[in-house]
């Protein structure tokens, strides 16, 4: 199942000469340290299941493990939303659900997870090696996206385990929001540590209840940005791309498709690594999002007729407020 980084249990120092006040002031820095390690690190999981009853039927489940409020969920296939993927559904917590064929039923399972049933035949039918991606826009974390696909050998009726394999990117608002809180907390932590540098520091010990729990890792921005360059996207089987790309505009389709720049970082680089290689979701630098393309007067790469052009498909006005009201 999911592998989660767990924060080691905090072992307070033995009570001694410092007394109750000293005890509390020593625990506080370690609580803050824990927050610095774990805060601002939401995770997205994706689970893909092929139904045993119907080989062309898939169920995709996605969830967001973060404390922020979700403002939009976008489900796509064939790759991430801004990198050649085609939108299957957009779920808005206030305005409802918009879905594109072959999506049959998108719905909220909880306030932080969604499910989507895909059915198709012929050109619009999904294939076993199709990659499905879920992008959660939330405040204050920003945008987080993860992709998953069925393992090549999976039998119908079986599902790939949830894959916490996010694309390491966040929107500017998320970075500023979380980073601001973290920066303040960590500066305060350093301040407290300096005050207590003459005292022996408490020891971090693994939790007694889970002695083999992996220690949490805090990724430095440089690590995150490097990792973002090396995360492989799953290979796209072009025969499984949705029919909407070809048939939505038979008369005078968009001429800008062929002339659009493609970003090397968004090209498929190898076989599907999502399901087998969980990558911790840690903050990273901003990559160019659909909304930024739109503001610059460009289209996102490979955007087809079935793809929304903004984080909210209602357009840039939707970002003015929670409901996009004028």
């Amino acid at each position: 199942m999911r592998t989660e980084a767990q924060v080691p249990a905090l072992q307070p120092p033995e009570p001694g000469l410092e007394g109750a006040m000293g005890h509390r002031t020593l625990v506080l820095p370690w609580v803050l340290l824990t927050l610095c390690v774990t805060a601002g690190t939401p995770e997205v999981w994706v689970q893909v299941r092929m139904e045993a009853t119907e080989l062309s039927s898939f169920t995709i489940r996605c969830g967001f493990l973060g404390s922020g409020s979700i403002s939009l969920v976008t489900v796509s296939w064939g790759g991430p939303n801004g990198a050649g993927g085609t939108t299957l559904a957009v779920l808005h917590p206030e305005r409802g659900i918009r879905q594109w064929a072959p999506a049959r039923q998108a719905r909220w399972e909880t306030q932080s997870s969604i499910s989507l049933i895909l059915e198709g035949s012929g050109a619009s039918s999904p294939c076993a090696n199709t990659t499905f991606c879920c992008k959660f826009a939330s405040f204050p974390e920003g945008s987080w996206e993860a992709c998953g696909s069925l393992p090549p050998s999976s039998d119908p009726g079986l599902s790939a385990p949830p894959t916490p394999a996010p694309i390491l990117r966040a929107d500017l608002a998320g970075i500023l929001g979380v980073s601001g809180v973290l920066l303040f907390g960590c500066v305060y932590l350093l301040h407290l540590l300096r005050r207590h540098k003459h005292r022996p520091a408490p020891r971090l010990q693994p939790s007694r209840t889970s002695p083999q729990a992996p220690r949490a890792r805090a990724w430095a921005p440089s690590q995150a940005s490097q990792a973002a360059l090396h995360v492989p996207y799953a290979t796209i089987n072009t025969s499984c791309r949705p029919a909407t790309l070809d048939t939505a505009h038979p008369h005078g389709g968009p001429s800008w498709w062929a002339s659009l720049p493609t970003h090397a970082a968004h090209r498929p680089q190898g076989p599907a690594a999502w399901a087998s290689t969980p990558i911790p979701a840690r903050g990273s630098f901003v990559s160019v999002e659909n909304g930024l393309y739109a503001q610059a007067g460009e289209r996102p790469p490979h955007t087809g007729p079935g793809l929304t052009l903004f984080p909210d498909p209602r357009g840039p006005r939707a970002m003015e407020g929670p409901l996009g009201v004028r």
């Epitope: 206030e94 879905q99 594109w100 999506a103 909220w108 306030q111 007729p305 929304t308 006005r317």
Partner: antibody
Framework: QVQLQQSGAELMKPGSSVNLSCKAT????????INWVKQRPGHGLEWIGE????????NYNEKFRGKATFTADTSSNTAYMQLSSLTSEDSAVYFC?????????????WGQGTSVTVSS | DIVMTQSPSSLAMSVGQKVTMSCKSS????????????LAWYQQKPGQSPKLLVY???TRESGVPDRFIGSGSGTDFTLTISNVQAEDLADYFC?????????FGGGTKLEIK
């Protein structure tokens, strides 16, 4: 006052195509989805699909995929629906309607409708 | 697709009476985030286009008289017209506006005796 003005009635031959128009006034055309709805006596209202003008983003009811094609001209604030390979089943009144601010599919303003009759 | 079923298909009332019509959906229209039900009611007078009366099951569109009252939750909804007027003669449609494709009920025809 928001208005959607639709083109006039059409009498068409089977097998032909027709292009219906819907001109929007008094709101920002590119900010709202335009929905197309079919009404036949005894069949109620059926959603054909939607287009977000200026974005090439469309969404079709599977039942009407291949039958209807949506386009929009942002310079004239006009949405279009082309119906192809017409049969008697396509005889109906067709409405355009604007998607609202508060929900994707609550339609707050409607055109007056265009009657299409398919007859040989 | 979500199936919408309206009843009765028609009813005849006298001016001043209270009218209730029902709409049922094949699945819940309740949004877990804002606890709103994504159901709309439209009025279509003869020879005219539909007009939005109520959305989110009970929120009246601006300009709609307060004698039109929407209620219900989940899968069962009601439109009540208190003190029916002659100008209320029309077809009334319910519609789920929760997910694609939006679907309509078959309609209730209100006739005035």
């Amino acid at each position: 006052q928001v208005q959607l003005q639709q083109s006039g009635a059409e009498l068409m031959k089977p097998g032909s195509s027709v292009n219906l128009s819907c001109k929007a006034t008094d709101y920002t055309f590119t900010d709202y989805w335009i929905n197309w709805v079919k009404q036949r006596p005894g069949h109620g209202l059926e959603w054909i699909g939607e287009i977000l003008p200026g974005s090439v983003t469309t969404n079709y009811n599977e039942k009407f995929r291949g039958k209807a094609t949506f386009t929009a001209d942002t310079s004239s604030n006009t949405a279009y629906m082309q119906l192809s390979s017409l049969t008697s089943e396509d005889s109906a009144v067709y409405f355009c309607a604007r998607g609202s601010d508060y929900s994707y599919y609550a339609m707050d303003y409607w055109g007056q409708g265009t009657s299409v009759t398919v007859s040989s | 697709d979500i199936v919408m079923t309206q009843s009765p298909s028609s009813l005849a009332m006298s001016v001043g009476q209270k009218v209730t019509m029902s709409c049922k959906s094949s699945q819940s229209l309740l949004n877990i985030f804002n606890q709103k039900n994504f159901l709309a009611w439209y009025q279509q007078k003869p020879g005219q286009s539909p007009k939005l009366l109520v959305y989110f099951a009970s929120t009246r569109e601006s300009g709609v008289p307060d004698r039109f009252i929407g209620s219900g939750s989940g899968t069962d909804f009601t439109l009540t017209i208190s003190n029916v007027q002659a100008e209320d003669l029309a077809d009334y449609f319910c519609q789920q506006h929760y997910s694609t494709p939006p679907t309509f009920g078959g309609g209730t025809k209100l006739e005035i005796k």
